[in-house]
Structure formats: structure tokens, C-alpha cells
Amino acid sequence: SETTTGTSSNSSQSTSNSGLAPNPTNATTKAAG
């Protein structure tokens, strides 16, 4: 079956199976070090 891995937010396909948000937000803090 067709996967929708990491599909773009511009596409009608779902990104859910990729495990990555369609347009991830920038983290608001820096890790120490």
C-alpha cells in the first residue's frame, strides 16, 4: 500500500504516518551546551 511518509503540507496526503509534523515549529529554547 502507498505510504504517505513525510508528505508536504502542500499536499492533500496526510503526514501522520511520517511521525513528523507537516510544518514543525521552531523550538523556543536552546539546550544547555
Epitope: 505510504t3 511518509t5 513525510g6 508536504s8 502542500n10 504516518n17 511520517s18 513528523l20 509534523a21 539546550a31
Partner: antibody, heavy 115, light 112 residues
Framework: EVKLEESGGGLVQPGGSMKLSCFVS????????MNWVRQSPEKGLEWVAQ??????????RYVESVRGRFIISRDDSKSSVSLQMNNLRTEDTGIYYC??????WGQGTTLTVSS | DVVMTQTPLALSVIIGQPASISCKSS???????????LNWLLQRPGQSPKRLIY???NLDSGVPDRFTGSGSGTDFTLKIGRVEAEDLGVYYC?????????FGGGTKLEIK
């Protein structure tokens, strides 16, 4: 069957360059964001770079430590993604995996940066 | 960057017994679409990582239902109902909500 096969690792001196490639089969490559992730004993698993789709104008993202030194690119006609690594540092040493999202991973290729 | 903290670092379990791994994130992983992009991976010795769970609790195809994922916001848990020999390896959580994507340090599951 989904396959992601990396190539191009090896030994390189600090300041040198190396290009990694990954060939993909088993899913629609042109519809998939592609990523490079590396693994080292010191840093564990670390996401390195991402390239999005043609419809996104092949937008790219990089982790801060490689920005300006690494360039990710893709060739949808060949279902391949590459990582051009320049001005390499010893801390870039590790196993480099190409992945599609978090779901599919290649077997990895080892880069050693050492004098 | 979002820091992913896994505990314990190592776990030694008798076959047939349960196991539990915790993953805590320094920021909420709830995305604006209402989904939470928290994944669990297993890296068996000498192999590349393999995903077990995505979106906190969804099992990948072929993953046994003895694995369950739960949690929300910043606190997540992977549970193995009854550990089997094939479960040994290092388990990682990884978040895909915030850029850059970040991984936990790993939990090594050993068989007693």
C-alpha cells in the same frame, strides 16, 4: 518492499569533503520528505538535515552545527537523496542514516573524520 | 532545542515480565493540528533503528501488540506487556513537533 541504501562513507581528514548518497525504492519518493540522521557514541542519534518536496521548492532544513557546511539535495527522477559535507570536523564522525520521516531507515554508512 | 530525557538508561528484564520506559520532553509536543508527534524506535544490536510507534500510541505494521505507547504533552511511556528475547536493544523516543527534531538518549533493554 521498502529499501533505503546509503553509500559514500569512509575516512576523510579534518577540513575535507565527502558526499553521501541514498537510493530509495518501495514507496513514492517524490512525495516524501527525506532526512539524514547521524549516530555517534558521544552524541547518540542526531537529526542532521531535511529536504522537502518540489511543491515546497525543495526547502531544506539543517541542524545548527552543520548549517553552512552541509548541503542536502535530491533527484526525484533517480529516487535519490545526497548529503554534500564540506569543511568536515572530527565531531562529524558517525554512522549516517537516510530516513523518510521516522518510519523508514537505511542501513547506514560510516564517516570517520580523522587525521 | 527540545530536550528528550529517557529513563531508565538500562533495564534488565526476565523474559515474560513487563517493562516500562519513560520519555519526558522539555516542551509540549502537542502540535497546532491537535496531534502529538512522539515516536518510539528500537535499535537492535548491529542494526539501524526501526520505528515501533508513532503519534504517541499508533503501532507500526508488524509490531506486536505487547507494545503500547501512552502519554501527552511532555510525559510519555512505552510499555512492553511481556518481554521476549527479540525485544533486546536500545529504545529511543524522538519528537517531530519542533525543529530541530530531537532524540532521547536511549534505554538499553537487556534480557536477564
Amino acid at each position: 518492499e521498502v529499501k533505503l541504501e546509503e553509500s559514500g562513507g569512509g575516512l576523510v581528514q579534518p577540513g575535507g569533503s565527502m558526499k553521501l548518497s541514498c537510493f530509495v525504492s518501495g514507496f513514492t519518493f517524490s512525495n516524501s520528505w527525506m532526512n539524514w540522521v547521524r549516530q555517534s557514541p558521544e552524541k547518540g542519534l542526531e537529526w542532521v538535515a531535511q529536504i522537502q518536496l518540489k511543491s515546497d521548492n525543495y526547502a531544506t532544513r539543517y541542524v545548527e552545527s552543520v548549517r553552512g557546511r552541509f548541503i542536502i539535495s535530491r533527484d526525484d527522477s533517480k529516487s535519490s537523496v545526497s548529503l554534500q559535507m564540506n569543511n568536515l570536523r572530527t565531531e562529524d564522525t558517525g554512522i549516517y542514516y537516510c530516513s523518510s520521516g521516522t518510519d523508514y531507515w537505511g542501513q547506514g554508512t560510516t564517516l570517520t573524520v580523522s587525521s | 532545542d527540545v530536550v528528550m530525557t529517557q529513563t531508565p538508561l538500562a533495564l534488565s528484564v526476565i523474559i515474560g515480565q513487563p517493562a516500562s520506559i519513560s520519555c519526558k520532553s522539555s516542551q509540549s509536543l502537542l502540535f497546532s493540528n491537535g496531534k502529538t508527534y512522539l515516536n518510539w524506535l528500537l535499535q537492535r544490536p548491529g542494526q539501524s533503528p526501526k520505528r515501533l510507534i508513532y503519534l504517541v500510541s499508533n503501532l507500526d505494521s508488524g509490531v506486536p501488540d505487547r507494545f503500547t505507547g501512552s502519554g501527552s504533552g511532555t510525559d510519555f511511556t512505552l510499555k512492553i506487556g511481556r518481554v521476549e528475547a527479540e525485544d533486546l536493544g536500545v529504545y529511543y523516543c524522538v519528537q517531530g513537533t519542533h525543529f530541530p527534531y530531537t532524540f532521547g538518549g536511549g534505554t538499553k533493554l537487556e534480557i536477564k
